[in-house]
Interface confidence: low
């Protein structure tokens, strides 16, 4: 029987800069029941606080609700593992909420085949930003990426859409059924998961003339 091994805070994510969650990996348990606590302070403060919510994020997590989240200061946090034989601490982790944002996927992806009379046909898609993100404040710039592939193909074709919430694609194979997905990321942060796939059938008479 031994003191617990050193835990590691391995990930912190925020959906929108208003709340965030951090997760840790336990070290070895030393063969005894082990309790974990996360403590933190905001840089510039001496007051130490304990994690306000160990439940919402699931096992080995700490969730910071709105009242505990400030995107203006850096959080300094560590996890303490304790059993009957002793304690061990994780390394301190510095967290700026600004840089850990991982939004939800974009919403309402719609895809249409457009066949204008006098121009090349194309695939037109549009989507909405995730609901938790408030773009009006100017605190966020969201960037988008689209991927698509014929249903039975192995490889995805990826297109960067910048800040647009609509996009056109010209080069498609007539008669094929395509899967289309979109994802987003803030300018400093992480890509969201891909949105659920939207299917679109490209008509056989989709003429790729010059």
């Amino acid at each position: 029987q031994l003191p617990p091994g050193k835990p590691e805070i391995f990930k912190c994510r925020s959906p929108n800069k208003e709340t965030f969650t951090c997760w840790w990996r336990p070290g070895t348990d030393g063969g005894l029941p082990t309790n974990y606590s996360l403590t933190y302070h905001r840089e510039g403060e001496t007051l130490m606080h304990e994690c306000p919510d160990y439940i919402t994020g699931g096992p080995n997590s700490c969730h910071f609700g709105k009242q505990y989240t400030s995107m203006w200061r850096t959080y300094v946090m560590m996890v303490n593992a304790t059993n009957q034989m002793g304690s061990s601490f994780s390394d301190e982790l510095y967290v700026d909420v600004t840089y850990i944002v991982q939004p939800d996927p974009p919403l309402e992806l719609t895809v249409e085949v457009k066949q204008p009379e006098d121009r090349k046909p194309y695939l037109w898609m549009k989507w909405s930003p995730p609901t938790l993100i408030d773009l009006k404040t100017g605190w966020f710039t969201l960037l988008y990426e689209i991927r698509l592939k014929p249903e039975k193909a192995a490889e995805w074709e990826t297109h960067f859409a910048g800040q647009q919430t609509e996009f056109k694609i010209l080069s498609l194979h007539p008669g094929q059924k395509y899967l289309v997905q979109v994802r987003c990321k803030p300018d400093h942060g992480y890509w969201s998961a891909w949105s659920p796939a939207t299917f679109i059938q490209i008509p056989s008479d989709f003429i790729m003339n010059d």
Partner: antibody, heavy 118, light 112 residues
Framework: QVQLVQSGGGLVQPGGSLRLSCAAS????????MHWVRQAPGKGLEWVSD????????NYADSVKGRFTISRDNAKNTLYLQLNSLRAEDTAMYYC???????????WGQGTLVTVSS | DIQLTQSPSSVSVSVGERVTIDCTGS?????????VHWYQQKPGQAPQLKIY???QRPSGVPDRFSGSKSGTDATLTISSLQAEDAAVYYC???????????FGQGTKLEIK
């Protein structure tokens, strides 16, 4: 060792503009908030502005809001302060500083003098 | 007007004596739990950090320098003054309502 080398000060007329630079070396620049602090001749220190590590967030003293702009180029390890609509009361020695915040050692540049006079 | 008020504004002390400098804030800065830093500035030089996080000494700072904080007040103490300690000393803390840093007005320490 940590170095902050400043440039860009000088004499400018009221209403004019200047751009101050602060070249950092000897530390991982993008890991630190950076700050500008000024000191009018014979007076105390006055905080001017700070900028977060990846630079989307900036704070300004009320006395310079809307006239001064802090920015940084992490690729060039350089901090900037753009001074517009300068007034006589902006005359001061301007210092750049690394990490005035807690849990950070504080390093200061040598200062660059800005004189606003007609 | 939100400020950090240092006292005294100047003091003259003999080598070997003890000197204390006080820094009084308010509920939006020191009293809010924000830490206090102390800087030393000699004529023609940039400020140097002497105490950070209320009572921590950066490496290389002699142990005659110490700091403390209680409520809305912070204190810098130099236990046995040396000639090279003559300088102006400033306290600094983050202020919530200004969303910015505040410096005290400075205390000029002279050697008798």
């Amino acid at each position: 060792q940590v170095q902050l080398v400043q440039s860009g000060g000088g004499l400018v007329q009221p209403g004019g503009s200047l751009r101050l630079s602060c070249a950092a070396s000897g530390f991982s620049y993008s890991d630190y908030w950076m700050h500008w602090v000024r000191q009018a001749p014979g007076k105390g220190l006055e905080w001017v502005s700070d900028i977060s590590r990846l630079s989307p967030y900036t704070n300004y003293a009320d006395s310079v809001k809307g006239r001064f702009t802090i920015s940084r180029d992490n690729a060039k390890n350089t901090l900037y302060l753009q001074l517009n609509s300068l007034r006589a009361e902006d005359t001061a020695m301007y210092y750049c500083a690394r990490g005035l915040d807690a849990r950070r050692m504080s390093y200061w540049g040598q200062g660059t003098l800005v004189t606003v006079s007609s | 007007d939100i400020q950090l008020t240092q006292s005294p504004s100047s003091v003259s002390v003999s080598v070997g004596e003890r000197v204390t400098i006080d820094c009084t804030g308010s509920s939006s800065n020191i009293g809010h739990g924000y830490v206090v830093h102390w800087y030393q500035q000699k004529p023609g030089q940039a400020p140097q950090l002497k105490i950070y996080r209320n009572n921590q000494r950066p490496s290389g700072v002699p142990d005659r320098f110490s700091g403390s904080k209680s409520g809305t007040d912070a204190t810098l103490t130099i236990s046995s003054l040396q000639a090279e300690d003559a300088a102006v000393y400033y306290c600094a803390a983050w202020d919530d309502s200004l969303n910015g840093w505040l410096f005290g007005q400075g205390t000029k320490l002279e050697i008798k």
